[in-house]
Interface confidence: medium
């Protein structure tokens, strides 16, 4: 009976990077008003928890809380919202949400082919490296909810590494790295220090921030 | 609790062959590599050879490479290490390690050990 | 590869500090921070005391610390107890993606 009603959204607090043994509360809302919410991660299948909705101000949601980050709570998850008390009548899944738990190994650097100071409209490509094995390499900017990831090219100079092109350089950003083997894609290394690249002729770095309704309400399930 | 149960050691003569079992409880087994490690009598620690959690990646010193097989059963949380061609230099006590991600690239450290088990290659 | 330098042995009077070193390469100790250091008690198996260089895992007592420079990693004990008299053994990620261990040290507790 999946799909009965429209699928909520699946967020995370602070956000879907997750250090070792810290928190993040994934919340699960929706403006239909569920009676329950259910959250999975995938590949455990019968790692599914229950949660009661609260309704508040035309949204109901539910917090998980996982209160203390470890490799084996990492990989993805969705929630489902349901009406009734049977399990078995859920709205279709949220979109996927990646938990990934960062700092395990150590941080990679970040430089910028051209420097960190570019003119408007030049190509940037930013390049992340290490002396560790990494397979991938993962490029986040602040500001924007999703990495870009490329793998790690051969060893050269006793460094792996990969080239981001970025493209015509329009605003500025702070750019951080991380890297990853292909056996655990949700366990990170520690960020590399951040990158700032400032783009010349461009008056504003600003960014929008996502709506997404309070988490400061209500007392959250915890998953460990 | 974690716990690691080394087991299948014993005299072998050179040339022939074991098979060392790890029984792990305590944590979830495919979430973190495993490895082996192994210490001649009186002598200290060498890494021998390590695995992924998922069992896609294993690793090798180059002293047992060709003649050592690592492998594991995430359904029964079991290691092993298969040990062919075996010499006389191969005599030590082998341990299990629990390693501290799934990757288990040589970027690991062993958090949890096992008592060993001892492997006696002699004619 | 061969096995990093540690002194084959050191001691120390309880209450005091000892110092063991594990000198390596560019190749393994001075390349990486991933340098663990390990205790083992006669017909024991090893514990795990300091990874990455410097930190402690829980349960280990912060008598023991870790630090690093260029190619040589050091493992310090202060207050030194009768129960920390055991052998000690460096280990590090090398470029060739291996784990390599030191020879070992005894530490003696007078």
């Known amino acids: 009976h999946e799909g009965v009603h429209r699928k909520p959204s699946l967020l995370a607090h602070p956000g879907r990077l997750v250090k070792s043994e810290e928190t993040v509360i994934l919340q699960c809302w929706s403006d239909v008003m569920f009676e329950h919410f259910l959250l999975h991660r995938e590949g455990m299948f019968n790692d599914t928890l229950r949660l009661i909705g609260e309704h508040h101000d035309g949204v109901s949601k539910a917090n998980f809380s996982i209160s203390r980050m470890t490799q084996d709570l990492a990989g993805t998850y969705r929630c489902y919202g349901s009406v009734t008390h049977s399990p078995y009548q859920v709205s279709a899944p949220s979109d996927p949400l990646d938990i990934v738990i960062i700092g395990l190994y150590e941080k990679p650097s970040l430089s910028a082919q051209l420097g960190p100071t570019v003119l408007a409209g030049e190509n940037v490509t930013l390049s992340c490296s290490s002396r560790s094995s990494y397979d991938m390499y993962h490029l986040s900017r602040e500001g924007e909810a999703h990495e870009r990831r490329l793998p790690a090219g051969p060893k050269v100079n006793g460094t792996f590494q990969a080239d981001f092109p970025l493209g015509p350089a329009t605003h500025g950003g702070t750019y951080r790295c991380f890297g990853s083997f292909h056996d655990s894609p949700y366990e990170w290394s520690k960020s590399s220090d951040p990158l700032l690249v400032s783009v010349t002729g461009n008056p504003s770095n600003s960014w929008p921030s996502p709506t997404e309704p309070s988490s400061k309400t209500g007392n959250p399930r915890h998953l460990h | 609790e974690v716990q690691l149960l080394e087991s299948g050691g014993g005299l072998v003569q050179p040339g022939g062959s074991l098979r060392l079992s790890c029984a792990a409880s305590g944590f979830t087994f495919s979430s973190y590599a495993m490895h082996w490690v192994r210490q001649a009598p009186g002598k200290g620690l060498e890494w021998v050879s390590t695995?992924?959690?998922?069992?896609?990646?294993?690793y090798y010193a180059d002293s047992v490479k060709g003649r050592f097989a690592i492998s594991r059963d995430n359904s029964k949380s079991t290691l092993y290490l298969r040990l062919t061609g075996l010499r006389a230099e191969d005599t030590a006590v082998y341990y299990c390690a629990k390693g501290r991600s799934r990757a288990g690239a040589g970027e690991d450290y062993f958090d949890f050990w096992g008592q060993g088990t001892l492997v006696t290659v002699s004619s | 590869q061969s096995a990093l330098t540690q002194p084959a042995s050191v001691s120390g009077s309880p209450g005091q500090s000892i110092t063991i070193s594990c000198t390596g390469t560019?190749?393994?100790?001075?390349?990486?921070?991933?340098v663990s250091w390990y205790q083992q008690h006669p017909g024991k198996a090893p514990k795990l005391m300091i990874y990455?260089?410097?930190n402690r895992p829980p349960g280990v007592s912060n008598r023991f610390s870790g630090s690093k420079s260029d190619n040589t990693a050091s493992l310090t004990i202060s207050g030194l107890q009768d129960e920390d008299e055991a052998d000690y053994y460096c280990?590090?990620?090398?470029?060739?993606?291996?784990?390599?261990f030191g020879g070992g040290t005894k530490l003696t507790v007078l």
């Open positions: 280990s590090s990620y090398t470029s060739s993606n291996t784990i390599i």
């Open positions: 695995i992924s959690g998922s069992g896609g990646s294993t």
């Open positions: 560019s190749s393994d100790v001075g390349g990486y921070n991933y």
């Open positions: 990455d260089v410097s």
